[in-house]
């Protein structure tokens, strides 16, 4: 009588997370009598996956009816595979013992690798807004994938970026992996409508990469340019002074008119005009009664944009002569962190 052999025909199998894994095992004899047990790993720390005779294993079903006469097929199916199930599985024949079963012979083992899809990439930008010409950092994270090999690319409006650094963790063997990448992006005034895209390609995605996006509208602050002009009106003693606030983003803006340094009126921007590039324009005017002034009047349009230090533009209104355009700038203050747009 030939001695029983335990045959595991598959050296390795690969299964997608969520699917079932079938681990094949046959024996060549009914003798010696005793159960088949399946283990993950070898040695004293091995994990029992299935015991033909003892215990309950809700995720495991046998491929064959083990109660059928002369059954020698002890293949099992493990349902709902996760990356944590990866490892080498051994089909082990035990000999009936008293009181305990005695290990008789083991199969060569089948390595189960689990293909797990990466999570949808999450792209996050800086906490504070930044102005054009500044460089900002974006991060992209994706988790839970296996195997470790993965490709990550960055794009800005469809153009691939090259200034980024990527890490895949952990460095050693693991049931699943995470990727973390940081890209540097230089902002331009035209970036309100721009998007930064992180693209992740993995064997589980069948050539259909996952993408995470960030809108630069949440990152950029475009400071306004100011222009103050005056127009005569029909009534000889009135002058209309307008302040054109152009090309700003986000919308949140407050404008104050000063007459000789004294606050004349404060208003919050509304009914804005949107430009093609996503920035906004706004205009405010002040009707000045010239006859009420004996001396020249200095009119200042002061704008506070998105919580930043005010910028202003002044216009000198000559009372003695006919009105004529005359202006002087005050230098804008340094850019500060913005609040969210209104």
């Amino acid at each position: 009588e030939e001695e029983l052999q335990v045959i595991q025909p598959d050296k390795s199998i690969s299964v997608a997370a969520g699917e079932s894994a079938t681990l094949h095992c046959t024996v060549t004899s009914l003798i010696p009598v005793g159960p088949i047990q399946w283990f993950r790993g070898a040695g004293p720390g091995r994990e029992l996956i299935y015991n033909q005779k003892e215990g309950h294993f809700p995720r495991v079903t046998t491929v064959s009816d083990l109660t059928k006469r002369n059954n020698m097929d002890f293949s099992i199916r493990i349902s709902n595979i996760t990356p944590a199930d990866a490892g080498t599985y051994y089909c082990v024949k035990f000999r009936k013992g008293s009181p305990d079963h005695v290990e008789f012979k083991s199969g060569a083992g089948t390595e189960l690798s689990v293909r797990a899809k990466p999570s949808a990439p999450v792209v996050s930008g800086p906490a504070a807004r930044a102005t054009p010409q500044h460089t900002v950092s974006f991060t992209c994270e994706s988790h839970g994938f296996s195997p470790r090999d993965i490709t990550l690319k960055w794009f800005k409006n469809g153009n691939e970026l090259s200034d980024f650094q990527t890490n895949v963790d952990p460095a050693g063997d693991s049931v699943s992996y995470s990727i973390h990448s940081t890209a540097k992006v230089v902002l331009t005034r035209e970036d309100v409508h721009s998007q930064v895209i992180c693209e992740v390609a993995h064997v589980t995605l069948q050539g259909d990469p996952l993408r995470g996006t960030a809108n630069l509208s949440e990152t950029i602050r475009v400071p306004p340019t100011l222009e103050v002009t005056q127009q005569p009106v029909r009534a000889e003693n009135q002058v209309n002074v307008t302040c054109q606030v152009r090309k700003f983003y986000p919308q949140r803006l407050q404008l104050t008119w000063l007459e000789n340094g004294n606050v004349s009126r404060t208003e919050t921007a509304s009914t804005l005009t949107e430009n093609k590039d996503g920035t906004y324009n706004w205009m405010s005017w002040l009707l000045v009664n010239v006859s009420a002034h004996r001396d020249d009047v200095k009119l200042t349009c002061q704008v506070e944009h998105d919580g930043q230090p005010a910028v202003s533009k002044s216009h000198d209104l000559k009372v003695s002569a006919h009105p004529k355009e005359q202006g002087s700038n005050t230098a804008p203050g340094p850019a500060l962190a913005s609040a969210a747009p209104l």
Partner: antibody, heavy 121, light 111 residues
Framework: EVKLEESGGGLMQPGGSMKLSCVAS????????MNWVRQSPEKGLEWVAE??????????HYAESVKGRFTISRDDSKSSVYLQMNNLRAEDTGIYYC????????????WGQGTTLTVSS | DIVLTQSPASLAVSLGQRATISCRAS??????????MYWYQQKPGQPPKLLIY???NLESGVPARFSGSGSGTDFTLNIHPVEEEDAATYYC?????????FGGGTKLEIK
């Protein structure tokens, strides 16, 4: 340690009914086929009934001499097997053993101590 | 039903000698190369105890002086050397098909 303990035997009149019980311990009861075998001086050892697993839809098999009168059942949650005996006859007298079938092949590796049924008027 | 006929009905064997018990089936109990025959030992007041499975394989915990052989319809249980504690009744049982049946028993006496 595997243990099988029968109960429910006694003296019955012909035509009467009786239910034998067997409580198992020391093994995963739900993974084993269970059997009843009886023994009498007249007939020797006589296999009576078998009940298989949930995965076998609790299939049952009976000796011709008890078919239609005896019913084997099991309650895996209580690790128990039962033998309901109706329309008892004098020839049903004997020691009734509860048995574990180790390898789904009438491999009777563990027997209880038995419970005695006497059918007599 | 498959009928199992045991012989002899009883035998007396001297201590240390060989005891041979035969079991003949009315029909083959062998399929796919396996012989579905079992042997049991029963002592007074106790349930039967499994000795041999599938005709020739020793059940765990059973002394090696017990051995089984045979195929098809003819099977043998051997005990050698016989010891005093082997005094008992021995039964063969088949599982070739339903219903399972037992032999009539062989009573072994030690001289």
């Amino acid at each position: 340690e595997v243990k099988l303990e029968e109960s429910g035997g006694g003296l019955m009149q012909p035509g009467g009914s009786m239910k034998l019980s067997c409580v198992a311990s020391g093994f995963t009861f739900s993974n084993y086929w269970m059997n009843w075998v009886r023994q009498s001086p007249e007939k020797g050892l006589e296999w009576v009934a078998e009940i298989r697993l949930k995965s076998n839809n609790y299939a049952t098999h009976y000796a011709e001499s008890v078919k239609g009168r005896f019913t084997i059942s099991r309650d895996d949650s209580k690790s128990s097997v039962y033998l309901q005996m109706n329309n008892l006859r004098a020839e049903d007298t004997g020691i009734y053993y509860c048995i574990r079938d180790y390898d789904y092949d009438a491999y009777f590796d563990y027997w209880g101590q038995g419970t005695t049924l006497t059918v007599s008027s | 039903d498959i009928v199992l006929t045991q012989s002899p009905a009883s035998l007396a064997v001297s201590l240390g000698q060989r005891a041979t018990i035969s079991c003949r089936a009315s029909k083959s109990v062998s399929t796919s190369g396996y012989n579905y025959m079992y042997w049991y030992q029963q002592k007074p007041g106790q349930p039967p105890k499994l000795l041999i499975y599938l005709a020739s394989n020793l059940e765990s915990g059973v002394p090696a002086r017990f051995s089984g052989s045979g195929s098809g319809t003819d099977f043998t249980l051997n005990i050698h050397p016989v010891e005093e504690e082997d005094a008992a009744t021995y039964y063969c049982q088949h599982s070739g098909e339903l219903p399972y049946t037992f032999g009539g028993g062989t009573k072994l006496e030690i001289k």
